[in-house]
């Protein structure tokens, strides 16, 4: 799966009800000033915001863990996409760590598809067809994180 | 194709007010900030404010706060700007502006609209 | 408010000079700096945001750079359609302020 995680530290946007629904929000890309009355950008490649909101901070952009890849870079608007780099991958189970991909299938199994960054290898046995289930399930669901969500500590 | 169509140019008495329109095509309404700027004869450019049809956010500058109201009609992709309590001082161009819900830079723009205030 | 200050209100520069437009910022605007080209009569056209980014379809003759407080616009081989009126603009903090242009002229 891919990795977008957000910083856990950030201070929570204020809580005050404000006079009227259509004021007090900045856009994306952006976060509000202390005394709420302006939007401030994100600055570009540090941190990001990806919603109408009353923060006082943007959320700060995710640094790629050695073992991963940037898919693609943090904008004001967007988060870091980390990606497993090639022969490793994520699990569901475990996402916060990238780990090998299998070599290879167990005696009377055939590889039915290549290690991916969100999946191992896949063997079926020869006769029947039936998946392998050893110590490391295939991950066929491809998860992603929405925006929001803390999908793994920050680097 | 992307385009803002303004609306005609105005003449109008000192103390009147005026509803400027901007009608949006060629993308989605919803998606995208729309903004008012006001250019005076062979001066610089301000912003008015902006107005955001997929939430109805408005914000506006603190200078143009009294002087300036936005709204939208979503069905027929249109912000409109009030300007209420005319002065020469408001006399100018009038642009709509969009831009995507990120940096605030205009990416688009109408053409424009003059308005004269002269008794 | 932040005031953007083009110092420069005339340019004289001829067809295939180089030329330099500048624009400072009464504080840093973190590289959140647009600037567009204004022609007689026409609405403004978006030529580089983020201080330093084209956007689509802008000639590559045009690049922008700077940060902190300092911002500048080159035009790398001046054609005679950019003779015209130039404007920086801060996105950083609402609300989004102008400089006050900058008119490129025929030497």
């Known amino acids: 799966i891919t990795r977008q995680s957000l910083d856990p530290q950030r201070r929570a946007a204020p809580q005050q009800k404000r006079s009227s629904p259509t004021e007090g929000l900045c856009p994306p890309g952006h976060h509000i000033s202390e005394d709420s009355r302006e939007c401030i950008s994100c600055k570009y490649g540090q941190d990001y915001s990806t919603h109408w909101n009353d923060f006082l901070f943007c959320l700060r952009c995710t640094k790629c863990d050695s073992g991963e890849v940037e898919v693609n870079s943090c904008t004001t608007t967007r988060n870091t996409v980390c990606q497993c780099e090639e022969g490793t991958f994520r699990e569901e189970d475990s996402p916060e760590i990238c780990r090998k991909c299998r070599t290879g299938c167990p005696r009377g199994m055939v590889k039915v598809k290549d290690c991916t960054p969100w999946s191992d290898i896949e063997c079926v046995h020869k006769e029947s067809g039936t998946k392998h289930t050893g110590e490391v399930p295939a991950v066929e669901k491809t998860v992603t994180t929405s925006p929001g969500t803390p999908a793994s500590p920050c680097s | 194709k992307v385009q803002l169509q303004q609306s005609g140019a105005e003449l109008v008495k000192p103390g009147a007010s005026v509803k400027l329109s901007c009608k949006a095509s060629?993308?989605?309404?919803?998606?995208?900030?729309l903004h008012w700027v006001k250019q005076k004869s062979g001066q610089g450019l301000e912003w008015i404010g902006w107005?955001?049809?997929?939430?109805?956010?408005?914000k506006y500058n603190e200078k143009f706060k009294d002087k300036a109201t936005l709204t939208a009609d979503k069905s027929s992709s249109t912000v409109y700007m009030e300007l209420s309590r005319l002065t020469s001082e408001d006399s100018a161009v009038y642009f709509c502006?969009?831009?995507?819900?990120?940096?605030?830079?205009?990416?688009?723009w109408g053409q424009g609209t003059t308005l004269t205030v002269s008794s | 408010d932040i005031v953007m200050t083009q110092s420069h209100k005339f340019m004289s520069t001829s067809v295939g000079d180089r030329v330099s437009i500048t624009c400072k910022a009464s504080?840093?605007?973190?590289?959140?700096v647009a600037w567009y080209q204004q022609k007689p009569g026409q609405s403004p056209k978006l030529l580089i945001y983020?201080?330093?980014t084209r956007h689509t379809g802008v000639p590559d003759r045009f690049t922008g750079s700077g940060s902190g407080t300092d911002y500048t616009l080159t035009i790398k081989s001046v054609q005679a359609e950019d003779l015209t009126l130039y404007y920086c603009?801060?996105?950083?903090?609402?609300?989004?302020?102008f400089g006050g242009g900058t008119k490129l002229e025929i030497k």
């Open positions: 502006a969009r831009h995507e819900q990120g940096p605030g830079y205009f990416d688009y």
């Open positions: 060629g993308y989605t309404f919803t998606e995208y900030i």
């Open positions: 107005f955001y049809p997929g939430n109805n956010n408005i």
């Open positions: 504080q840093d605007v973190n590289t959140a």
């Open positions: 983020w201080a330093s």
């Open positions: 603009q801060q996105h950083y903090i609402t609300p989004w302020t």
